[in-house]
């Protein structure tokens, strides 16, 4: 009876999400493998988040708008492990917008989700950021490693969206 009611709850939750995400990929997790964590298909999952690599080329504002339409934000990178996971799926000859910007050009960087910008957990390429006119951050592959670079916000780039996992 308990299992039955849990299944019914899950099904109704799935139907609720179905209007936003036609397909979800779920995995069982938790102490008793009773919880399901889901990401929209074909998003990838790492820890408690889902990630989507958008290969359409858009300005930073449009990229954030595009993520937002999907219930996400441009990616906020909190750890080196998270960045290493993300970069596994990136093309080395491309650049991707992050959810990091300096709107006034005062070198006050801020994340889209209001996570405090911590200078100690940043992965700028050597010599970056280097221009107050370049107010948006990308991740790209340079000098044999992935790192961040400041760029003009209106020049179209690919992007990475991030959202919290859906728990049912």
């Amino acid at each position: 009876n308990f299992m039955y009611s849990k299944t019914v709850k899950r099904l109704s939750k799935l139907q609720e999400y179905q209007q936003y995400y036609p397909s979800l990929t779920c995995v069982m997790e938790g102490k008793d493998m009773e919880d399901w964590s889901c990401c929209p298909t074909p998003w990838t999952s790492f820890q408690s988040s889902c990630y989507f690599i958008s290969t359409v080329m858009q300005s930073w504002t449009k990229s954030q708008n595009n993520c937002s339409v999907m219930g996400a934000d441009l990616v906020v990178i909190n750890t080196k492990e998270e960045q290493d996971f993300i970069t596994q799926n990136l093309k080395i000859n491309s650049a991707y917008f992050l959810g990091l910007s300096d709107p006034k050009g005062w070198r006050h960087w801020q994340w889209v989700d209001q996570t405090p910008y911590n200078k100690n957990v940043t992965f700028w390429h050597s010599g970056e950021p280097n221009s107050p006119d370049e107010r948006c951050a990308i991740i790209n592959f340079r000098s044999e490693e992935w790192g961040w670079n400041d760029v003009h916000c209106h020049v179209p780039q690919k992007s990475i969206c991030k959202m919290k996992k859906i728990y049912i």
Epitope: V56, M57, Q58, S59, T61, K62, N65, V69, A95, D133, V151, H152, C153, H154, V155, P156
Partner: antibody, heavy 120, light 107 residues
Amino acid sequence: DVQLQESGPGLVKPSQSLSLTCSVTGYSISSGYYWNWIRQFPGNKLECMGYISYDGSNYYNPSLKNRISITRDTSKNQFFLSLNSVTTEDTATYFCVRGGDYDDGGFAYWGQGTLVTVSA
Amino acid sequence: DIQMTQSPASLSASVGETVTITCRASGNIHNYLAWYQQKQGKSPQLLVYNAKTLADGVPSRFSGSGSETQYSLKINSLQPEDFGNYFCQHFWIIPYTFGGGTKLEIK
């Protein structure tokens, strides 16, 4: 004020390469924005061909496959279009255009255009 | 690619009249739409960006509206200098494609 000016041969033979130059005054092409080539066919249809960004990165319209190359010479503040293996279908007026104005919402600066005819 | 369908292809009107040109996108372009005017032998001139904002120096008789996939350009009280070709162009995702154009002729 920013000004763009196209130049190049007006007549190209089929199977040859089309080469055009855009000379920019009033703004350094390596300082910002992205720099496009757009063409307008005889029936007035407009097509974005591709661009070179201020940082030297490129985008090419997939419809042009591997025929297109856009390069630049920052010392002369010029950027270039090369289109290989042209056919009569490439006959058009070619414009160079600055991209990225109004948070990338419209193309405000265009060259006056140069007509290129592909004919034997 | 997003396809832009513009209508009508041609339009005859008299000075003083009001005309409307429409553009339909094959997908939601989130108001990232521009309108241009082009005179014979000249390059296109930006009139409107972001669906409804007039570019610098554009007279207030021009106005843009619309959302999602449907957009329009309205010209109130047509002036002799308004005749020519009009194009829409979306700016949502690269490549930014144009509508087929509307030829506005004097009646």
